[in-house]
Interface confidence: low
C-alpha cells in the first residue's frame, strides 16, 4: 500500500452470499492516480484476474460482474490498481460465498416469533443428515456475510435482548471449515417479528 | 449441454456388490451434486442417496449399510458402490444432477439383473 | 419417512384437454415439491420444483400448484408429447420420497 492513502473500498452491490448460477455486481472505489483498475481473486495466495477497466476521463467506480456463480467464483476478491508500470495499490478484500452446494439445514425457535423489546429468543440450526462443522444464520435483506457464525452442531444463535431491527426474515446456512465459501441451501425461513404493541395481529410463515 | 451416463455390470450374482459409474460433462461435480436413483421394474422411484458438491454425501437410511457414494471431480466420475445384492435390488440404477435441492437432469440409466 | 400419495395412477385424455395431477404429503412439505416427467422408452426430465418453478425450456402449459400437504401438476392443451409418466417429488425430508406415478395415455 503507498504511503498513508485511506486503502480504496470494494462492495458487492447486493448480497455477497449468491446462490448458484447466481450474478452479483462488484464494485471498485476509483482512485485518480490509477490508469487500470483491475479485479482480483485470491485462491492459495496466488492473484487471478477476473476483469479490468481502463481509466476514463467521466469514470465513476469501475463495477464488475461476476455471473454463473460457482465454487470457482467463490472466495476473497480484491481490486488492483495499476499508478505506473511496476506500482500498485490495493483495495481491502471482499468475501463472496456461493450457496447450494449441501443440502439445507433446518432452523427452529425455542419459542413464539412475536416478541417485545428487550425480549430473548434463540434459534436453532441443525442438519441431520450433513455433518456440518459450522452454521451461519443470515437476516433477509442484508449486504454483509452474516455475523452470527457456530461451531457447535446443532448450532445456537441467541438474539436478544431484542430490539426493533432485529424484526426480519432469518435463514441458517451449513458450511465446512475446510471450504468457508461454498455453503448449503438455506434453511426453511423463520419470520421475526419484534414490536412494541402485543395487541396488533401478527401472522408468521415459514 | 449437460449430460450424464452410467454405467455397470448389467448382472450381478446374490451376496455379491454392485459398482456404477456415472460419467458426467456439461458441468463440473464441485458446482453440482449427484443424485442416485433406482426403480424396480415394474415399481415406484426409490432414492438412493447423493454426493453433494462439496463432497459429503447423504443416504437413505434403508440402504446406508450396504451404500457408499463418491466421486472424483478431475475425471467427472460419480461412484455407487452397494454391497449384497439380493434378487430384489434389480432395478434400472439413474444418476441425476441436482438442482435447488432437487433432479433436474437424468442420465438414461442402466439396468442391473441380480441373478444366479 | 414422507409418504407421497399421488393420483391418479392413470388417466385417458384426448389432445387440447387440461389435466391435473395430484399428491399428498403425509405431512406438511412447504412446496419442497417437485414433478418430473418420464417419456415412453426415455428418462427422467425436471418439469417443475419448489412447487410452482418451472425447470429451464419447459413449455408454460405446465404449472405447479398447492401448499401445506396437497399440491398439483396442471397440463392445459395438452400435446402429443405430454402423454408420459409424471412422478412428484419431495424434499422436505430425507429421505427424497416419490409418489408412484400417473400414466397419461391418449384416449
Known amino acids: 500500500q503507498e504511503g498513508d492513502f485511506p486503502m480504496p473500498f470494494i462492495s458487492a452491490k447486493s448480497s455477497p452470499v449468491i446462490p448458484l448460477d447466481g450474478s452479483v455486481k462488484i464494485q471498485c472505489q476509483a482512485i485518480r492516480e490509477a490508469y487500470l483498475t483491475q479485479l482480483m481473486i485470491i485462491k492459495n495466495s496466488t492473484y487471478r484476474e477476473i476483469g479490468r477497466r481502463l481509466k476514463f476521463w467521466n469514470e465513476t467506480d469501475p463495477e464488475f460482474v461476476i455471473d454463473h456463480m460457482d465454487a470457482n467464483k467463490a472466495g476473497r476478491y480484491q481490486c488492483q490498481y495499476r499508478i505506473g508500470h511496476y506500482r500498485f495499490r490495493y483495495s481491502d478484500t471482499l468475501e463472496l460465498v456461493v450457496t447450494g452446494l449441501y443440502g439445507k439445514p433446518f432452523l427452529s425457535a425455542d419459542r413464539g416469533l412475536v416478541l417485545m423489546p428487550g425480549e430473548n429468543i434463540s434459534l436453532t440450526c441443525s442438519s441431520a443428515h450433513i455433518p456440518f462443522d459450522r452454521f451461519s444464520l443470515a437476516k433477509e435483506g442484508e449486504l454483509s456475510l452474516p455475523q452470527h457464525q457456530s461451531g457447535e452442531h446443532p448450532a445456537n444463535f441467541s438474539l436478544g435482548p431484542v430490539d426493533l431491527n432485529v424484526s426480519g426474515i432469518y435463514r441458517c446456512y451449513g458450511w465446512y471449515n475446510r471450504s468457508p465459501y461454498l455453503w448449503s441451501f438455506p434453511s426453511n425461513a423463520l419470520e421475526l417479528v419484534v414490536t412494541d404493541s402485543i395487541h396488533q395481529d401478527y401472522t408468521t410463515q415459514n | 449441454r449437460v449430460q450424464l451416463k452410467e454405467s455397470g455390470p448389467g448382472l450381478v450374482a446374490p451376496s455379491q456388490s454392485l459398482s456404477i459409474t456415472c460419467t458426467v460433462s456439461?458441468?463440473?461435480?464441485?458446482?453440482?451434486?449427484v443424485h442416485w436413483v433406482r426403480q424396480p421394474p415394474g415399481k415406484g422411484l426409490e432414492w438412493l442417496g447423493i454426493?453433494?458438491?462439496?463432497?459429503?454425501?447423504s443416504y437413505n437410511s434403508a440402504l446406508m449399510s450396504r451404500l457408499s457414494i463418491s466421486k472424483d471431480n478431475s475425471k467427472s466420475q460419480v461412484f455407487l458402490k452397494m454391497n449384497s445384492l439380493q434378487t430384489d435390488d434389480t432395478a434400472m440404477y439413474y444418476c441425476a444432477r441436482d438442482h435447488y435441492d432437487l433432479f433436474a437432469y437424468w442420465g438414461q440409466g442402466t439396468l442391473v439383473t441380480v441373478s444366479a | 419417512d414422507i409418504l407421497m400419495t399421488q393420483s391418479p395412477s392413470s388417466m385417458s385424455v384426448s389432445l387440447g384437454d387440461t389435466v391435473s395431477i395430484t399428491c399428498h404429503a403425509s405431512?406438511?412439505?412447504?412446496?419442497?415439491i417437485g414433478w418430473l416427467q418420464q417419456k415412453p422408452g426415455k428418462s427422467f426430465k425436471g418439469l417443475i420444483y419448489?412447487?410452482?418453478n418451472l425447470e429451464d425450456g419447459v413449455p408454460s402449459r405446465f404449472s405447479g400448484s398447492g401448499s401445506g400437504a396437497d399440491y398439483s401438476l396442471t397440463i392445459s392443451s395438452l400435446e402429443s408429447e405430454d402423454f408420459a409418466d409424471y412422478y412428484c417429488?419431495?424434499?422436505?425430508?430425507?429421505?427424497?420420497?416419490f409418489g408412484g406415478g400417473t400414466k397419461l395415455e391418449i384416449k
Open positions: 405431512q406438511d412439505i412447504s412446496r419442497n
Open positions: 454426493i453433494w458438491a462439496g463432497g459429503s454425501t
Open positions: 419448489h412447487g410452482t
Open positions: 456439461g458441468f463440473s461435480l464441485t458446482s453440482y451434486g
Open positions: 417429488v419431495q424434499y422436505a425430508q430425507f429421505p427424497r420420497t
